[in-house]
């Protein structure tokens, strides 16, 4: 049994890091493998992650971590029984994929303005809370070409757009994702999308 593709990990910079790797053949990850991880710190204890299958030869493990900060560095040991298959390390702050924003809501009752709001996925005491910026994707269910991205570079998790910038009388969907420049993160996954019917009063033509 050998590791074909070494583990690569990403952290949500809060409580979970996800590591993925590939073996050289079909593997029952949960029964044959264990990923041990330990913070390089005074008094830290070793933890064991039981991997799940991710395709025939692929494995994925969700590592639980408390109180993640920049200085944290973890040792990783991948075991098959008594055999050490791979040894490495992982610094969560250098491989951050933020959590996806939640509770995306479209408020259509503000005079011909669409107000989109969503929730910051981090608690206020997490460093990323004040450093997320967002991308909002709006698209028409009827017209695949009617697809737009709005970059929200301020901290407020909201976006206002004139309803008239979208077509009237048709349904639209929106979703939002986040990233943080300070840690050079990847983009988060998209939030679940929300749907609304866009209608507004056309101005009278003179």
């Amino acid at each position: 049994m050998k590791v074909l593709q070494e583990p690569t990990c990403v952290s949500d910079y809060m409580s979970i890091s996800t590591c993925e790797w590939k073996m050289n053949g079909p593997t029952n990850c949960s029964t044959e493998l264990r990923l041990l991880y330990q913070l390089v710190f005074l008094l830290s204890e070793a933890h064991t992650c039981i991997p799940e299958n991710n395709g025939g030869a692929g494995c994925v493990c969700h590592l639980l971590m408390d109180d993640v900060v920049s200085a944290d560095n973890y040792t990783l040991d991948l075991w098959a029984g008594q055999q050490l298959l791979w040894k490495g390390s992982f610094k969560p702050s250098e491989h951050v994929k933020p959590r996806a924003p939640g509770n995306l809501t479209v408020h259509t009752n503000v005079s011909d303005t669409l107000l989109l709001t969503w929730s910051n996925p981090y608690p206020p005491d997490n460093y990323l809370y004040n450093h997320l910026t967002y991308a909002v994707n709006i698209w028409s269910e009827n017209d695949p070409a009617d697809f737009r991205i709005y970059n929200v570079t301020y901290l407020e998790p909201s976006l206002r757009i004139a309803a008239s910038t979208l077509k009237s009388g048709i349904s639209y969907r929106a979703r939002v994702r986040a990233w943080a420049q300070c840690y050079n993160t990847t983009w988060s996954e998209w939030s679940p999308s929300t749907k609304w019917h866009n209608s507004y009063r056309e101005p009278f033509e003179q």
């Epitope: 008094l43 900060v69 200085a71 005491d125």
Partner: antibody, heavy 116, light 111 residues
Framework: QVQLVQSGAEVKKPGASVKVSCKAS????????MHWARQAPGQGLEWMGI????????SYAQKFQGRVTMTRDTSTSTVYMELSSLRSEDTAVYYC?????????WGKGTLVTVSS | QSVLTQPPSVSAAPGQKVTISCSGG????????VSWYQQLPGTAPKLLIY???KRPSGIPDRFSGSKSGTSATLAITGLQTGDEADYYC????????????FGTGTKLTVL
């Protein structure tokens, strides 16, 4: 919100022991390390040791080895710091502080006076 | 005895800028992250800067931190009378299984 509430001031005689408590609230007690530091009057901060509330393991500054004991009670989310064989130079304010590499939350401090 | 050296005192007038240095070595600052604490008279220390240059929420951007080699610096701009306090740098010693260490402390006087 996170709170660390320390026990009240103590006056002790040389040679005696003192046990200072630090009750934590507003977070998952076993998920965060707790440190103890002290500050003698007009002096700087001095680290004493650390306890991992999850398993109760400890590590102490060499200066206090053999004289200090840190324990925790998970049922009450409280950590304790006991210092024995007290001498006059142990007169100080003793702080508990939550964190790993740096400490964002501190108790208000407990003044321990050692005097004959 | 602290192995992180700070100037005993610094002073400046309101509105001015002041810097406080913290000098260490390769087994501490040179190989670690630095934090800074403010201690107002009669109170517990308060975290001002962590991870060399990050501010906890609620700390104004008048406070900034930097690190270069085996030294770190705290800068305070737009000095206010309420900034008069003792300031401590902190890091950990990689030669003693990550035991924390503090600087000697600096008394800031706002003239």
């Amino acid at each position: 919100q996170v709170q660390l509430v320390q026990s009240g001031a103590e006056v002790k005689k040389p040679g005696a022991s003192v046990k200072v408590s630090c009750k934590a609230s507003g977070y998952a007690f076993t998920s965060y390390y707790m440190h103890w530091a002290r500050q003698a009057p007009g002096q700087g901060l001095e680290w004493m040791g650390i306890i991992n509330p999850s398993g109760g393991s400890t590590s102490y500054a060499q200066k206090f080895q053999g004289r200090v004991t840190m324990t925790r009670d998970t049922s009450t989310s409280t950590v304790y710091m006991e210092l024995s064989s007290l001498r006059s130079e142990d007169t100080a304010v003793y702080y508990c502080a939550r964190g790993k590499w740096w400490w964002q939350h501190w108790g208000k401090g407990t003044l321990v006076t050692v005097s004959s | 005895q602290s192995v992180l050296t700070q100037p005993p005192s610094v002073s400046a007038a309101p509105g001015q800028k002041v810097t406080i240095s913290c000098s260490g070595g390769s087994s501490n600052i040179g190989n670690s992250y630095v934090s800074w604490y403010q201690q107002l008279p009669g109170t517990a220390p308060k975290l001002l800067i962590y991870d060399n240059n990050k501010r906890p929420s609620g700390i104004p951007d008048r406070f900034s931190g930097s690190k270069s080699g085996t030294s770190a610096t705290l800068a305070i701009t737009g000095l206010q009378t309420g900034d008069e306090a003792d300031y401590y740098c902190g890091t950990w010693d990689t030669s003693t299984t990550y035991h924390p260490i503090f600087g000697t402390g600096t008394k800031l006087t706002v003239l």
